[in-house]
């Protein structure tokens, strides 16, 4: 399986929210013994390879954000844990993954990769991650919503508040 | 904070079947591995296995013919079992969180077992 | 399995000094690499994960670094409490294994 990231770059408001997404690619086996462990923090394009680095999101670890189940069952981290820092992430039946970063400010610009752990059983774990960049803009020049930029060409799109 | 507390018998009898349990306190079982790890007297650290959540498991070749994890979730609990001890299976027994595409981060604090006659 | 091999076994330093560790995979293992910490009488405690990630609460005087077969564990200036067992471990096959060891003591 892959994890596709349909937009590279989001640019949003200052204040705005924002929904970051990630996709599972390819098939998906939905039998007992595999399960998917999920999650998000960010990063730095590093030495080694993008999203080798592991920084909080507004101070929430990676274990903070986590999302587990087994195939495409649906699933959220921790509601409490994750509200109280304007973050929630979910996963949908379909191989969608994210996460809602609520209230943006200057400092939530950055590098974010999601990250599919494969879980299966007598197997090794098969890791996965994508990239993506959000910058949040004040200021005159900054757009009244969000634009995500596509990862496959250079259109835009306007999209609403999450 | 999540803690973990190994409790069993420290001596056990050759040929037998060594028997220990893992209670998960102060956070939940669900969606990491559990593991068992073991250092004998003065030596290095050997993964055993480990079950994860969804019942999951994986055992170290060297001793999958031995061994057997299981978990009782409503317990918050997870257990090992070694058969047909012999003396080389005189160690420190560690259980441990193991959190996928990271590491061991949280360890209980050990427990000896003596295969002894 | 892939076997970690760590050197040296023992490295002698004083308070202060710089301490260089070694551990060298018998294939690749990417960056799946983490070191721990081990004092008498107590279980492994997590420094690095990831080749280079500091572990929560681990002071910056830890570093690791490396990829591939040859890593690293910097520990820039020894503090009293450093003395210990130094143990790297693999995560990129399973069985999952750890280095034999390299025991840091007081010149």
């Known amino acids: 399986f892959k994890v596709a990231t349909p937009y590279s770059l989001y640019v949003c408001p200052e204040g705005q929210n924002v929904t970051l997404t990630c996709r599972l690619l390819g098939p998906v086996d939905k039998g007992h013994d595999v399960t998917f462990y999920k999650t998000w923090y960010r990063s730095s394009r590093g030495e080694v390879q993008t999203c080798s680095e592991r920084r909080p999101i507004r101070n929430l670890t990676f274990q903070d954000l986590h999302l587990h189940h087994g195939g495409h069952q649906a699933a959220n981290t921790s509601h409490d844990l994750a509200q109280r820092h304007g973050l929630e992430s979910a996963s949908d039946h379909h191989g969608n993954f994210s996460i809602t970063m609520r209230n943006l400010t200057l400092l939530d610009s950055g590098l974010y990769c999601c990250l599919v752990v494969e879980i299966r059983a007598a197997a090794s774990e098969h890791r996965v991650h994508g990239a993506m960049e959000l910058q949040v803009q004040t200021g005159k020049d900054a757009p009244s919503n969000c634009v995500v930029y596509p990862s496959s060409s250079q259109d835009s799109e306007n999209i609403t508040a999450a | 904070q999540v803690q973990l507390q190994e409790s069993g018998p420290g001596l056990v009898k050759p040929s037998e079947t060594l028997s220990l349990t893992c209670t998960v306190s102060?956070?939940?079982?669900?969606?990491?591995?559990w593991s068992w790890i073991r250092q004998p007297p003065g030596k290095g650290l050997e993964w055993i296995g480990y079950?994860?959540?969804?019942?999951?498991?994986n055992y170290n070749p060297s001793l999958k013919s031995r061994v057997t994890i299981s978990v009782d979730t409503s317990k918050s609990q997870f257990s090992l079992k070694l058969s047909s001890v012999t003396a080389a299976d005189t160690a420190v027994y560690y259980c441990?969180?193991?959190?996928?595409?990271?590491?061991?981060?949280?360890w209980g604090q050990g427990t000896m077992v003596i295969v002894s006659s | 399995e892939i076997v970690l091999t760590q050197s040296p076994a023992t490295l002698s330093l004083s308070p202060g000094e710089r301490a260089t560790l070694s551990c060298r995979a018998s294939?690749?293992?990417?960056?799946?690499l983490a070191w721990y910490q081990q004092k008498p009488g107590q279980a492994p405690r997590l420094l690095i994960y990831?080749?280079?990630n500091r572990a929560t609460g681990i002071p910056a005087r830890f570093s690791g670094s490396g990829s591939g077969t040859d890593f690293t564990l910097t520990i820039s200036s020894l503090e009293p409490e450093d003395f210990a067992v130094y143990y790297c471990?693999?995560?990129?096959?399973?069985?999952?294994?750890f280095g034999g060891g390299t025991k840091v003591e007081i010149k």
């Open positions: 102060g956070g939940s079982i669900s969606s990491y591995y």
């Open positions: 441990a969180r193991d959190i996928p595409a990271f590491a061991f981060d949280i």
């Open positions: 990831d080749a280079f």
């Open positions: 079950i994860y959540y969804s019942g999951s498991t």
């Open positions: 471990q693999q995560r990129i096959n399973w069985p999952l294994t």
């Open positions: 294939q690749s293992v990417s960056y799946y």
